[in-house]
């Protein structure tokens, strides 16, 4: 094949390389740029800055490299629009720092700085961290400080992420109220800071004040929903970023639900919980307070993180007629209290009984097609029976 | 599958305290069961000693309520027996066991 | 009473059916379990509520229950099933356990 004239040509089905000296002073417009997946680039003395909008379009871009060229900055951002790279030779440039945003997001499994005039500072403690822990190839460049000894020796005892202290009413929050959270940011070189609300969405009305180093947050309005929601304060420096999430509890009245009894592999009266604090919980049976036992027992499901509401079983173990009944759950918490009953029959009396037996009541079955071992249950329709037993 | 295995002192001076673990393994003993501990002086029946649930419910046999105590360690996925004020008639094989139908039982430790 | 009375012991011709019984108030309000044991071993559950049999017990053996009467009934007896066996339940409260006091199977 004829040699390319051009500042950069073709490698493979989907590679550029940029070699020819001095041709590129960005990389605006570079030809074919949306099926790379290899750019590589060397010698271009004009090339200095790596931006946002240098790299847009190049999306499928897994592997870069930029070589003995100019390159004096690259953007915090600069591969926003390049997620799937994960070489980075930037070897040989003259680059004096990379902000830990540059790489942040990205799962790199090479990142090549040799060769580099670096200066020694907190900006570099990522770097010094990846090679500590042995990432990306890292430890292997044995990196330099420009007239500062190697990266490794840096002092690294001053330079630590932002320390954030979130402040929340200590004072028992109720539906209605309007509640003010503060966030305090200490520590060096403070770049940005704010407030993470994703999670409220219709849980209260938000208003932000203030600023670095004291950002505030009005949470007006509150309702229940906003029980074990995420409210994230944020702030980031030249080393790092920090994130410290606090949650409101919004106090509210205990309430409750009962369903009818399922049989699964055992039987299940299900119900669901719900309260700020959560409530304590109590299950009678016909009036009575029910003990619960192995074969009788409350059983919760697995609670969702983010809501209040908790659901689950008062369990019955192979339940006979003794266990037929009115089932109340009372529910309680210092804001109010609630029950609900419901009616369970599990099956006519499975022992053959005499004639000088009590008469037990049935009430009204559960209709269900049983697999299991245990007593067939009752089919008929009336909505309560009395069982006789005729001498 | 579930396995459990008691351990503790096999000798316990009068008046003292008898303590025995049970160790779960196989399974996690925060799951939907109940554990008892179940006893057998040599030559004699079963006796029921107590059963308790993770969320810390439990239940005693009538004739030892006063003496014992039964509580889970959910971080170390056991439970554990302590009976107080131990005479000779104390003296039994004891076996912890998976509540309500006892189908899975430690091999059991004489005391 | 909250308590299981069981014969101290049965006998039983090698091939033949043999019934255990346990007797007791309870057992009109509930199930009982039946535990196989043999010396120097735990006990291993054989028969629970109805007629539940876990996997691993031969289906010679079965239960049965009537009036307050519970029943475990090996069908063929085998010179393995050579046991102590114990049944349980709940006491008349269903708030406690309570064993019955257990019966010697010896087959001849």
């Known amino acids: 094949a004829a040699p390319c004239p051009d500042a950069c040509c073709p490698h493979g089905s989907s590679g550029l390389r940029c070699t020819r000296d001095g041709a590129l002073d960005s990389l605006h417009h570079l030809p074919g740029a949306e099926n790379l997946t290899e750019l590589y680039i060397e010698n271009q003395q004009h090339l200095q800055h790596l931006e946002l909008r240098d790299l847009r379009g190049l999306g499928e871009l897994r592997n870069l490299t930029i070589v003995k060229s100019g390159l004096r900055f690259v953007a915090p951002d600069a591969f926003h629009f390049t997620p799937r790279l994960s070489r980075l030779n930037l070897s040989f440039n003259a680059l004096e720092s990379l902000s830990w945003k540059t790489v942040q997001g990205l799962s790199l499994q090479e990142l090549v700085l040799s060769g580099n005039p670096l200066h020694c500072s907190c900006a570099l403690r990522w770097l010094q961290r990846w090679e500590e822990e042995g990432l990306g190839g890292v430890p292997e460049q044995k990196l330099q400080c420009h007239g500062q000894g190697p990266l490794a020796h840096m002092p690294n005892a001053s330079c630590g992420v932002p320390t954030l202290k979130v402040q929340v009413p200590n004072a028992s929050v109720d539906v209605g109220d309007d509640v003010l959270l503060r966030c305090q940011v200490e520590g060096r070189g403070l770049e940005q800071a704010g407030w993470i609300l994703t999670e409220l969405e219709q849980s209260a009305t938000v208003m932000k004040s203030g600023g670095l180093p004291s950002l505030g947050l009005t949470l007006a309005n509150v309702t229940s929903d906003l029980n074990r929601k995420n409210v994230t304060c944020w702030a980031e420096n030249d080393v790092g970023r920090a994130e410290v999430s606090v949650q409101v509890n919004v106090s509210f009245p205990a309430s409750v639900q009962l369903h009818t009894a399922v049989e699964m592999h055992h039987w299940c009266i299900p119900f669901s919980v719900d309260g700020q604090p959560a409530p304590s919980l109590r299950w009678l049976f016909n009036g009575s307070v029910l003990n619960e036992t192995s074969f009788i027992f409350t059983e919760f499901l697995e609670p969702a993180a983010n809501e209040t509401v908790r659901h689950g079983c008062l369990r019955l173990n192979q339940p006979t007629h003794v266990n037929n009944g009115n089932y109340t759950l009372l529910a309680a918490n210092p804001f109010g209290q609630a029950s609900a009953s419901i009616m369970a029959a599990f099956m006519d009396n499975p022992f053959e009984f005499n004639p000088e037996d009590p008469i037990p009541v049935s009430f009204s079955p559960v209709d269900t097609n049983s697999t299991s071992g245990d007593p067939v249950e009752k089919k008929d329709e009336t909505p309560f029976g009395v069982s006789v037993a005729v001498g | 599958q579930v396995q459990l295995q008691e351990s503790g002192p096999g000798l316990v001076k009068p008046s003292g305290t008898l303590s025995l673990t049970c160790a779960v393994s196989?399974?996690?003993?925060?799951?939907?069961?109940?554990w008892t501990w179940v006893r057998q002086p040599p030559g004699k029946g079963l006796e029921w000693i107590g059963e308790?649930?993770?969320?810390?419910?439990?239940n005693y046999n009538p004739s030892l309520k006063s003496r014992v105590t039964i509580s889970v360690d959910k971080s170390k996925n056991q439970f554990s027996l302590k009976l107080s004020s131990v005479t000779a008639a104390d003296t039994a094989v004891y076996y912890c066991?998976?509540?309500?139908?006892?189908?899975?039982w430690g091999q059991g430790t004489l005391v | 009473s909250s308590e299981l009375t069981q014969d101290p012991a049965v006998s039983v011709a090698l091939g033949q059916t043999v019934r255990i019984t346990c007797q007791g108030d309870?057992?009109?309000?509930?199930?009982a379990s039946w535990y196989q044991q043999k010396p120097g071993q735990a006990p291993v559950l054989v028969i629970h509520?109805?007629?539940n049999r876990p996997s691993g017990i031969p289906d010679r053996f079965s239960g049965s229950s009537s009036g307050n009467t519970a029943s475990l009934t090996i069908t063929g007896a085998q010179a393995e099933d050579e046991a102590d066996y114990y049944c349980?339940?709940?006491?008349?409260?269903?708030?406690?356990?309570?064993f019955g006091g257990g019966t010697k199977l010896t087959v001849l």
């Open positions: 066991a998976r509540a309500p139908f006892f189908d899975r």
């Open positions: 196989g399974g996690s003993i925060s799951s939907s069961n109940w």
């Open positions: 308790i649930y993770h969320r810390g419910n439990r």
């Open positions: 309870s057992l009109r309000s509930y199930y």
């Open positions: 509520g109805k007629n």
């Open positions: 349980n339940s709940q006491d008349s409260s269903g708030n406690h356990l309570i």
